[in-house]
């Protein structure tokens, strides 16, 4: 759960990903935004950062926990099938930017049940750690569809 020992490579996307949309109608506002003309713009920036930061935190928490775990124990868990190795490898091998993009490629829970099922399975199988707790916060308490729809509304994948 440390914020100090994060995977820095996958952190670097956050600021640039939260840049304003490159819509021509917003050119002037974009310029003011990048120059920090309005305090309210910083609030909007923080709004856009919040969802992706949370996903990044989840990934780093999981990554850090795996690094702490003994290698042979990790191997045994893989062998026993209690660790979703394919999904784990995917998440660890991707930056949060790609993970979010992967999540929002669909247009809602109905349109990509396989992806949601994978995330649900990941949360369910990591029942012993904070990664599971945080995923369950979204999946169980708040519903994956609502969270993903929120991500879609922020148009993260449209940002360059």
């Amino acid at each position: 759960r440390s914020l100090q020992d994060t995977e820095e490579k996958s952190r670097s996307f956050s600021a640039s990903q939260a840049d304003p949309l490159s819509d021509p109608d917003q050119m002037n506002e974009d310029k003011r935004h990048s120059q920090g003309t309005f305090t309210s713009d910083y609030s909007k920036y923080l709004d856009s950062r919040r969802a992706q930061d949370f996903v990044q935190w989840l990934m780093n928490t999981k990554r850090n926990r795996n690094n702490i775990a003994k290698r042979h124990d990790e191997f045994e868990r893989h062998a026993e099938g209690t660790f979703t190795s394919d999904v784990s490898s995917y998440l660890e091998g991707q930056a949060a930017k790609e993970f979010i993009a992967w999540l929002v490629k669909g247009r809602g829970r109905r349109d990509f049940p396989e992806e949601v099922a994978i995330v649900e399975e990941l949360g369910r199988r990591h029942a012993d750690g904070s990664f599971s707790d945080e995923m369950n916060t979204i999946l169980d308490n708040l519903a994956a569809r609502d969270f993903i729809n929120w991500l879609i509304q922020t148009k993260i994948t449209d940002r360059k």
Partner: antibody
């Protein structure tokens, strides 16, 4: 370990300028946003400015907007705060702070540098 | 901006006793999409940099002793030191990072 060392503070007359620096070490500087936060005896801790890791976004508190400019040199692991048109209200200890993985959360702070605006 | 108000302004507690500091925000800092409260606690000792203790209202930062704990949700939050140690004498600040960051005025903790 992470270290942030501010410099450039001092006594300056109202209306004059000052440039603060913050030398960073112990982490990959160009992957984190950086902030300036100040602490005045009367006002307490007050967020001043933010610059994103790639310099694409800068934001300022209303109290300093148009007078202060935050910048960074990623090749030298250094953060700057250019302060113009200083007033007595700007008298404070200025801290640079590293943003954590979560936006606007500060996981490391410098010791601070004192800026006194007085005639 | 969100206004943060701490109470009390100062607090004297005996060594080994519990210390409780409160923080109230002028509006909710709960983010419904992940059910997290964007509230942090910092410790400031003389001639030392500020230190992050707690974030998301209740998560202890790495290396912070487990006698420090955070609780609360929405607009009302509490920092608790379960058994005060001499090295805990400091000024404690709450900060919301839900919006443009703002801090409480600080609570000075001393030994009785």
């Amino acid at each position: 370990q992470v270290q942030l060392v501010e410099s450039g503070g001092g006594v300056v007359q109202p209306g004059r300028s000052l440039r603060l620096s913050c030398a960073a070490s112990g982490f990959t500087f160009n992957t984190y946003g950086m902030h300036w936060v100040r602490q005045a005896p009367v006002k307490g801790l007050e967020w001043v400015a933010f610059i994103s890791n790639d310099k694409s976004n800068t934001f300022y508190a209303d109290s300093v907007k148009g007078r202060f400019t935050i910048s960074r040199d990623n090749s030298k692991n250094t953060l700057f705060l250019e302060m113009n048109s200083l007033t007595a209200e700007d008298t404070a200890v200025y801290y640079c702070a590293k943003e954590s993985i979560l936006a606007a959360l500060f996981d490391y702070w410098g010791q601070g540098t004192l800026v006194t605006v007085s005639s | 901006d969100i206004v943060m108000t701490q109470s009390p302004d100062s607090l004297a507690v005996s060594l080994g006793e519990r210390a409780t500091i409160n923080c109230k925000s002028s509006q909710s800092v709960l983010y419904s999409s992940n059910n997290k409260n964007y509230l942090a606690w910092y410790q400031q000792k003389p001639r030392q940099p500020l230190k992050l203790l707690i974030y998301w209202a209740s998560i202890r930062e790495s290396g912070v002793p487990d006698r420090f704990s955070g609780s609360g949700s929405g607009t009302d939050f509490t920092l608790t030191i379960s058994s005060l140690q001499a090295e805990d004498v400091a000024v404690y600040y709450c900060q919301q990072f839900y919006s443009v960051p703002t801090f409480g005025q600080g609570t000075k903790l001393e030994i009785k």
